[in-house]
């Protein structure tokens, strides 16, 4: 799924020349260099459809295109997650899936896309102008969220022209947090390289077990910061609010996974084709600051609400992701 980056293995320096500390400072630049080179800007997409068979049943599909590895997906409705939205489902690549009414079936379609079917009846059922949002937490990009609504005509097999204003945002977690670290790392890397300029260069040799790494062009966090300051994302006011499910929100940390049966479908159940794509293992937790970086959604002419910038009220959030890359 990802392209590979050949990271050269460093030949250890001669004993006594640099010592263990020197070796560590030589390895670190290569790790930083890999991260500097591989940071990209993910694309997140959302698709909302009404089922032909059950007109009050919705299917939400979301996908993530990026170089990092997905550590968590949160699907919400009624607005962005953390800005008035209510969590419908949380999908973790290893720990499985949790969902709350009216979500009927959440599943991984592929390693980078998910789908969620919503029950159509009852007080908490969605209506046509409900906003659905998908938030992907990934390493090293951070958290990225996109939102969408049902298109005006949503018969399967036909797509209508757009009227809903889409929402696309990314948490500063991924921009000022991780990217800030990367920027600092890149500066530090340059500093180290300058320091090592007058020393004998280590011999490089191709690694026989080169780790896989994504390859997307790095981009300047400062650009993102500027965008964050100037570009709010569009919000869609919905007259149809979901039933209050706030008690179901998994804000208490990862412990809520404990109640999840081990068989709870973190591998897609069903078509055999899905069984052949196991989700890779993930590493340890990376804690990041959860500010908000907003990207503008398109606002249809003469329609829709004003543009509003929501801060995320929940403060810092733990985000799981590997310290290495897939």
């Amino acid at each position: 799924m990802r392209t590979e980056a050949q990271v050269p293995a460093l030949q250890p320096p001669e004993p006594g020349l640099e010592g263990a500390m020197g070796h560590r400072t030589l390895v670190l630049p290569w790790v930083l260099l890999t991260l500097c080179v591989t940071a990209g800007t993910p694309e997140v997409w959302v698709q909302v459809r009404m089922e032909a068979t059950e007109l009050s049943s919705f299917t939400i599909r979301c996908g993530f295109l990026g170089s990092g590895s997905i550590s968590l997906v949160t699907v919400s409705w009624g607005g962005p997650n953390g800005a008035g939205g209510t969590t419908l489902a949380v999908l973790h690549p290893e720990r499985g899936i949790r969902q709350w009414a009216p979500a009927r079936q959440a599943r991984w379609e592929t390693q980078s896309s998910i789908s969620l079917i919503l029950e159509g009846s009852g007080a908490s059922s969605p209506c046509a102008n409900t906003t659905f949002c998908c938030k992907f937490a990934s390493f090293p990009e951070g958290s990225w969220e996109a939102c969408g609504s049902l298109p005006p005509s949503s018969d399967p097999g036909l797509s209508a022209p757009p009227t809903p204003a889409p929402i696309l945002r990314a948490d500063l977690a991924g921009i000022l947090g991780v990217s800030g670290v990367l920027l600092f790392g890149c500066v530090y890397l340059l500093h180290l390289l300058r320091r090592h300029k007058h020393r004998p260069a280590p011999r490089l040799q191709p690694s026989r077990t080169s780790p896989q790494a994504p390859r997307a062009r790095a981009w300047a966090p400062s650009q993102a910061s500027q965008a964050a300051l100037h570009v709010p994302y569009a919000t869609i006011n919905t007259s149809c609010r979901p039933a209050t499910l706030d008690t179901a929100h998994p804000h208490g940390g990862p412990s809520w996974w404990a109640s999840l049966p081990t068989h709870a479908a973190h591998r897609p159940q069903g078509p055999a084709a899905w069984a052949s794509t196991p989700i890779p293992a993930r590493g340890s937790f990376v804690s990041v600051e959860n500010g908000l970086y907003a990207q503008a959604g398109e606002r249809p002419p003469h329609t829709g609400p004003g543009l509003t910038l929501f801060p995320d009220p929940r403060g810092p959030r733990a985000m799981e992701g590997p310290l290495g890359v897939r």
Epitope: L65, T110, P151, A216, Q223, A273, E298
Partner: antibody
Framework: QVQLQQPGTELVKPGASVKLSCKAS????????MHWVRQRPGQGLEWIGN????????NYNEKFKTKATLTVDRSSSTAYMHLSSLTSEDSAVYYC?????????????WGQGTTLTVSS | DIVMTQSQKFMSTSVGDRVSVTCKAS??????VAWYQQKPGQSPKLLIY???YRYSGVPDRFTGSGSGTDFTLTISNVQSEDLADYFC?????????FGGGTKLEIK
């Protein structure tokens, strides 16, 4: 209406570089990912990369990473692709395309393409 | 990279016939597939996305199906204006990749 305007042809010499343009109109340029696709004569389509005009964030196909550089000018709603160290292998039609941002993922509008000829 | 294979480079059919263009992905892409039509001298045009959703304005004789690794674009009641190249494309992961194309020829 939505339009992506590209120059019809570019003729350059081997070893030179060129900057292809794609002027967008009829929609909010900053909120749509812009993609670039190459098509060699009689061949299929190859994805080069994409750029998000709002912040300049981009992704590249590894194959084109040293060949292409994507940029945008928000003030003129124009996406650019700079191609360097050109050889006859780079002769092709280069398309820019807009990715829909409200309903799944697809290219709903394409430019007419710029035919790049690299010849001495 | 995910390889999208369109095994039939050329297909010949007659007006009024039904024809199926196939596309196989090298790994599971779910339903993250689009189909484009490219007429001679023109840029590609979207026909189908999400494997089976017909884009606005596309005639209903074009239908898409499949999921996982195998996808089909079916054109029923083929018209002379359907003479074109047809490309599948996956958008499950970067780099985005296209099939090699199938040229539909009208007898």
């Amino acid at each position: 209406q939505v339009q992506l305007q590209q120059p019809g042809t570019e003729l350059v010499k081997p070893g030179a570089s060129v900057k292809l343009s794609c002027k967008a109109s009829g929609f909010t340029f900053t909120t749509h990912w812009m993609h670039w696709v190459r098509q060699r004569p009689g061949q299929g389509l190859e994805w080069i990369g994409n750029i998000y005009p709002s912040n300049g964030g981009s992704n590249y196909n590894e194959k084109f990473k040293t060949k292409a550089t994507l940029t945008v000018d928000r003030s003129s709603s124009t996406a650019y692709m700079h191609l360097s160290s050109l050889t006859s292998e780079d002769s092709a039609v280069y398309y820019c395309a807009r990715r829909v941002n409200w309903d799944g993922y697809y290219f709903d509008y394409w430019g007419q393409g710029t035919t790049l000829t690299v010849s001495s | 990279d995910i390889v999208m294979t369109q095994s039939q480079k050329f297909m010949s059919t007659s007006v009024g016939d039904r024809v199926s263009v196939t596309c196989k992905a090298s790994q599971n892409v779910g339903t993250n597939v689009a189909w484009y039509q490219q007429k001679p001298g023109q840029s590609p045009k979207l026909l189908i996305y999400s494997a089976s959703y017909r884009y606005s304005g596309v005639p209903d004789r074009f239908t898409g199906s499949g999921s996982g690794t195998d996808f089909t674009l079916t054109i029923s009641n083929v018209q002379s204006e359907d003479l074109a190249d047809y490309f599948c494309q996956q958008y499950n992961s970067y780099p985005l990749t296209f099939g090699g194309g199938t040229k539909l020829e009208i007898k």
